[in-house]
Interface confidence: medium
């Protein structure tokens, strides 16, 4: 299996009750506006064929996409949560900037691309869905990167 380097986040990032709550509240607000409950972005299909030792790298890719293609364009919505959560997630992204995989990551990129394609295909409702799954993104980062 490919070797992942520097794919670690300190536990303290996930031990801040206030920002944890704000992240989950943002997800809740967005999920209330999500009518497409049959589609799941962060779930079994995303993780398929990706070992846990590669999972943090996978979630880094999802985090970066979510920030750049979803949260920044939608930054005026779901206030006041968005203005607090986006900088927090951006800090996590920055801390994972040196996380990479030595070797073939095609299987990971393929899974991430499917997530990206789904969001793009759904348009704005895809972006809302991605925000509604920030709780899953948060939990997956915690599960994989500590």
């Amino acid at each position: 299996a490919p070797i992942s380097s520097h794919c670690r986040l300190d536990k303290s990032n996930f031990q801040q009750p206030y920002i944890t709550n704000r992240t989950f509240m943002l997800a809740k607000e967005a999920s209330l506006a999500d009518n497409n409950t049959d589609v799941r972005l962060i779930g079994e299909k995303l993780f398929h064929g990706v070992s846990m030792s590669e999972r943090c790298y996978l979630m880094k890719q999802v985090l970066n996409f979510t920030l750049e293609e979803v949260l920044f364009p939608q930054s005026d919505r779901f206030q006041p949560y968005m203005q607090e959560v986006v900088p927090f997630l951006a800090r996590l992204s920055n801390r994972l900037s040196t996380c990479h995989i030595e070797g073939d990551d095609l299987h990971i990129q393929r899974n991430v691309q499917k997530l990206k394609d789904t969001v793009k295909k759904l348009g704005e409702s895809g972006e809302i869905k991605a925000i509604g799954e920030l709780d899953l993104l948060f939990m997956s980062l915690r599960n994989a990167c500590i």
Epitope: K11, F14, P17, T20, N21, F24, M25, A27, K28, S31, T37, R40, I42, G43, E44, L46, F47, S51, M52, S53, R55, D135, L136, M139, S140, R142, N143, A144, I146
Partner: antibody, heavy 121, light 110 residues
Amino acid sequence: EVQLVESGGGVVRPGGSLRLSCAASGFTFDDYGMNWVRQAPGKGLEWVSGVNWNGGTRDYAASVKGRFTISRDNAKNSLYLQMNSLRAEDTALYYCARGWYSGAAWNMGYWGRGTLVTVSS
Amino acid sequence: QAVLTQPSSVSGSPGQSITISCTGASGDVGAYNFVSWYQQHPGKTPKLIIYDVNKRPSGVSNRFSGSKSSNTASLTISGLQAEDESDYYCSSYTSTFSVVFGGGTKVTVL
């Protein structure tokens, strides 16, 4: 076939200790978060503790925090629960449970048959 | 004690539909889509029948369906059958990284 086999239960006096083990087979153990769930005789299910794939995060129910310690040995495909300062209310059947898919340990899709812990003087 | 509230018993005739409620708080069921449902026959181990509010594991009958509204999750069993007589438990993941269960509901097929 996924198999989870618990062991280590028994009768212990209040204040005593026990160490439960769960031997896992039939899947890539270090791809999954794991949990301990207990069920007192004739009662409902109570989550006790959970651990992520590499032991980096360990979470506990308030009722056992500071007394119980969850750990895992991926080389041995084993999950453990060290139980100290045991109380009568800890008497239960203790289940080892695995997540349904590896990204979410809280969806407990596979369960062992349990090991019985009795705390009595 | 159980953190999520379920009715202690629900009954129905064969072929009917029944719904079991699971009421929590804004910190668990209300906030996140991490609700699971388990079936437990007497003397047997629990079986996951619904996860992430409304997803069914492979092999679970499509007669079982899950939903959620505000702080209450629901499990519906349609076309009730004799083998559905069992205890049912809901659970939810929380933002404090713990799992909470309901007290369980005994389903009786009349």
